[in-house]
C-alpha cells in the first residue's frame, strides 16, 4: 500500500452535499440482513490529508485510548505506533491498558521503500463511530519504523482489511475484520465512501473538513446514486478482481487483457495513484496525451512528478478523456465499466508560492506489480467490501468531484467473452504490496 | 534543512569508469527527482540524467550510452556512474534536488573529477 | 534536444544597472524555464522557476518573464554580490538542456 501520494478530502464540492441524507427507492435485490439502508452514526466518520490516507478514529485498550488509524484494503495487519515517535501526537501505551495480553511474538514488515517492526499482542478494540461493539483484535504494537509515519499526516497506526494470507509475519495472525465478524454479529461486509476534495486543503481545512465514510457491515444508500454492480474477488488476499477492457475517451486500448491484470489488480484505499503495469500505463498516457494534444504539458507530468497550473478557476477539464475500466461481472461473459473523469486522476496539489494558480500531478504512474486501484478510482466511487459473497460493488459516490458536462459513471452490462483468461496466474511467493 | 553532498574519486583514468554519490538530507527521495549536472572548467552547465523520486530514469541522449544513475532510496543516497572516461570528461559534478516545477532548487557543492593518466 | 541560447557572455555592467539577460528555446517551453546563479566559488542556486516566481531568499530584484520560446532574467538594481554566471534552464522536455551561460563583469 502507497501512502504519501493523496489527501482524498471533500469538503463540498461536486454530488449531492453529505449532510443531506433522503431515502431513495432502488431497484436492488431485496437486503440481506444487516444491510440497512441508513448508518447514520458511520456516515462521515473518515478524515485525510493530501497524499496521506484516509484514516478513522479507534480505541484500543482498557481504559480506552482513542487513536486516528489509516484505512487500508491493501494490506492486512492493525498496527499502531506504540512508542514514541517524533511525528506521532499520541501512541498506544500498552502498560496502561489492563486488558492488554502479551503473545510473546515480533512483527518486522519491510517495504520497497522504509519498514516497520513490533510486538504482538492483543486487546479490545472498538470503532466510536462504527458498530457498537467490542472485540479482542490482534495489534503489532510498533516499536520501530523507517519512513513509515508521515509527519502531519494525523494518523497513528493502520488498519489493515485485506485477508488473512497477506498478514504478517503469516497467515495465522488473524486480522480485525475477520476477528469483528467472529465475535459479533456485525455482517461480513463494510463500504468505503472517499471523498476527494477536488482542490488542495490547508490543515485547518483538513481538520474542519469531511474525508468520507466507512460503513461496517452494511450499505448505505445515501452515498451512492444509481445502481451497485458488482465484480468477483478473484482471490481473497489482496481484494483481488479482474480487468477486461480499458477505454481512453471511449477508445479501446486493444491490448491483451493479461496485461491489465499482470501481475494482479487489487482495491487498494492505502493508494493514491491509479497504478497500471508498464505496458498499459504507457499505451494509457500516449493516449490521454493524444486525447489532451491542444495543450502541451512537460514530460515530468507524466511520470506524476512536476505540476500543471492554470489560473485558478480555468482548469480545461474538458481537453482530459474519462477513463473507463470493464470489470469482470456475477454473470458469465458479462462485464460493466467504470468510467472516472480528470478530476480524479488530476490531483489538486497546494502551491507554496502562489494561491492565482490551481496546480496539479497527474496520479496514474507505472507498476511493476499489477494494477492498483487506489484513492484515483475509489473517489469517484461508493465501494461495497463485500466478503460474505466473495465480490465487490461499485456505485456512482454522491460525492465525488465533477463539472456540469462529465460525470464519474458505472454502467453495464456490456457482453465480454474468454474473461476467465484476463487473469493472471501468479507463482507462489509471500510477496505484499505495501507501501510499494 | 535540505542538504546534498557529493563524493567522487577526484582523479580517474582514460577508460575507466567513474562512479560517484549523492548523500541527500532533509527530503526523501521517494518525494523529488534527483538530477546531475557537470562543468567542465571554463565552460558552461550540462544536464547529465535525472532519477525520478518514483524510480525511473532520463538520460542526456549524447550520453545515454554509457550513463547510469540509481539510487537507494532507504539510505538517502543518490549514484551516478559513467564508463569509459576520456579526458573531456573531466569537471566538476554536481547533484541538485528537483522541484516539482522542473526547477532544481537545491545543488550539492559539486565535486571535481579529472580524467587523466 | 531543445537549444537553449543565452544573452552574449560575457556582459559588460556597472552597480546600480538594470541588467537584463536573455534565453531563447529551439521550441516552446511552455513557461518551463528556471534561471540559476553561479557564484565564482562554484556555488550554483536557484533564483527564478517556472519563469517568473522567485525561489524562496532570492531578493526581490530578480524577476522573470516570458513565454513560447523567449524568456529574460531582469536584475533591477545591480549588487556587488551579483557578480556571477547565470544560466537559464528548460524543464519542459526530455534530455533537459542549459543555456550557455551569461557572466556579468563590471566595467
Known amino acids: 500500500t502507497q501512502h504519501g501520494i493523496r489527501l482524498p478530502l471533500r469538503s463540498g464540492l461536486g454530488g449531492a452535499p453529505l449532510g443531506l441524507r433522503l431515502p431513495r427507492e432502488t431497484d436492488e435485490e431485496p437486503e440481506e440482513p444487516g444491510r440497512r439502508g441508513s448508518f447514520v452514526e458511520m456516515v462521515d466518520n473518515l478524515r485525510g490529508k493530501s497524499g496521506q490516507g484516509y484514516y478513522v478514529e479507534m480505541t484500543v485498550g482498557s481504559p480506552p485510548q482513542t487513536l486516528n488509524i489509516l484505512v487500508d484494503t491493501g494490506s492486512s495487519n492493525f498496527a499502531v505506533g506504540a512508542a514514541p515517535h517524533p511525528f506521532l501526537h499520541r501512541y498506544y501505551q500498552r502498560q496502561l491498558s489492563s486488558t492488554y495480553r502479551d503473545l510473546r511474538k515480533g512483527v518486522y514488515v519491510p517495504y520497497t521503500q522504509g519498514k516497520w517492526e513490533g510486538e504482538l499482542g492483543t486487546d479490545l478494540v472498538s470503532i466510536p463511530h462504527g458498530p457498537n461493539v467490542t472485540v479482542r483484535a490482534n495489534i503489532a504494537a510498533i516499536t520501530e519504523s523507517d519512513k513509515f509515519f508521515i509527519n502531519g499526516s494525523n494518523w497513528e497506526g493502520i488498519l489493515g482489511l485485506a485477508y488473512a494470507e497477506i498478514a504478517r509475519p503469516d497467515d495465522s495472525l488473524e486480522p480485525f475484520f475477520d476477528s469483528l465478524v467472529k465475535q459479533t454479529h456485525v455482517p461480513n461486509l463494510f463500504s468505503l465512501q472517499l471523498c476527494g476534495a477536488g482542490f488542495p486543503l490547508n490543515q485547518s481545512e483538513v481538520l474542519a473538513s469531511v474525508g468520507g465514510s466507512m460503513i461496517i457491515g452494511g450499505i448505505d444508500h445515501s452515498l451512492y446514486t444509481g445502481s451497485l454492480w458488482y465484480t468477483p474477488i478473484r482471490r481473497e488476499w489482496y481484494y483481488e478482481v479482474i480487468i477486461v477492457r480499458v477505454e481512453i475517451n471511449g477508445q479501446d486500448l486493444k491490448m491483451d487483457c493479461k496485461e491489465y491484470n499482470y501481475d494482479k489488480s487489487i482495491v487498494d484505499s492505502g493508494t493514491t495513484n491509479l497504478r497500471l503495469p508498464k505496458k498499459v500505463f504507457e499505451a494509457a498516457v500516449k493516449s490521454i496525451k493524444a486525447a489532451s494534444s491542444t495543450e502541451k504539458f512537460p514530460d515530468g507530468f507524466w511520470l506524476g512528478e512536476q505540476l500543471v497550473c492554470w489560473q485558478a478557476g480555468t482548469t480545461p477539464w474538458n481537453i482530459f478523456p474519462v477513463i473507463s475500466l470493464y470489470l469482470m461481472g456475477e454473470v458469465t461473459n458479462q462485464s460493466f465499466r467504470i468510467t472516472i473523469l480528470p478530476q480524479q486522476y488530476l490531483r489538486p496539489v497546494e502551491d507554496v508560492a502562489t494561491s492565482q494558480d490551481d496546480c496539479y500531478k497527474f496520479a496514474i504512474s507505472q507498476s511493476s506489480t499489477g494494477t492498483v486501484m487506489g484513492a484515483v478510482i475509489m473517489e469517484g466511487f461508493y465501494v461495497v467490501f463485500d466478503r460474505a459473497r466473495k465480490r465487490i460493488g461499485f456505485a456512482v459516490s454522491a460525492c465525488h468531484v465533477h463539472d456540469e458536462f462529465r460525470t464519474a459513471a458505472v454502467e453495464g452490462p456490456f457482453v465480454t467473452l474468454d474473461m476467465e483468461d484476463c487473469g493472471y496466474n501468479i507463482p507462489q511467493t509471500d510477496e505484499s504490496t505495501l507501501m510499494t | 534543512e535540505v542538504k546534498l553532498m557529493e563524493s567522487g574519486p577526484g582523479l580517474v583514468a582514460p577508460s575507466q569508469s567513474l562512479s560517484i554519490s549523492c548523500t541527500v538530507s532533509g527530503f526523501s527521495l521517494t518525494s523529488y527527482g534527483v538530477d546531475w549536472v557537470r562543468q567542465p572548467p571554463g565552460k558552461g552547465l550540462e544536464w547529465l540524467g535525472v532519477?525520478?523520486?518514483?524510480?525511473?530514469?532520463n538520460y542526456n541522449s549524447a550520453l545515454m550510452s554509457r550513463l547510469s544513475i540509481s539510487k537507494d532510496n532507504s539510505k538517502s543516497q543518490v549514484f551516478l556512474k559513467m564508463n569509459s572516461l576520456q579526458t573531456d570528461d573531466t569537471a566538476m559534478y554536481y547533484c541538485?534536488?528537483?522541484?516539482?516545477?522542473?526547477?532544481?532548487?537545491?545543488w550539492g557543492t559539486g565535486t571535481t573529477v579529472t580524467v587523466s593518466s | 534536444d531543445i537549444v537553449m541560447t543565452q544573452t552574449t557572455s560575457p556582459l559588460s555592467v556597472s552597480l546600480g544597472d538594470r541588467v537584463t539577460i536573455s534565453c531563447r528555446a529551439s521550441q516552446d517551453i511552455s513557461k518551463y524555464l528556471n534561471w540559476y546563479q553561479q557564484r565564482p566559488d562554484g556555488t550554483v542556486k536557484l533564483l527564478i522557476y517556472?519563469?517568473?516566481r522567485l525561489h524562496s531568499g532570492v531578493p526581490s530584484r530578480f524577476s522573470g518573464s516570458g513565454s513560447g520560446t523567449d524568456y529574460s532574467l531582469t536584475i533591477s538594481n545591480l549588487e556587488q554580490e551579483d557578480i556571477a554566471t547565470y544560466f537559464c534552464h528548460q524543464g519542459h522536455k526530455i534530455p533537459y538542456t542549459f543555456g550557455g551561460g551569461t557572466k556579468l563583469e563590471l566595467k
Open positions: 541538485a534536488k528537483r522541484d516539482y516545477f522542473g526547477g532544481l532548487n537545491v
Open positions: 532519477v525520478w523520486g518514483g524510480g525511473s530514469t
Open positions: 517556472y519563469t517568473s
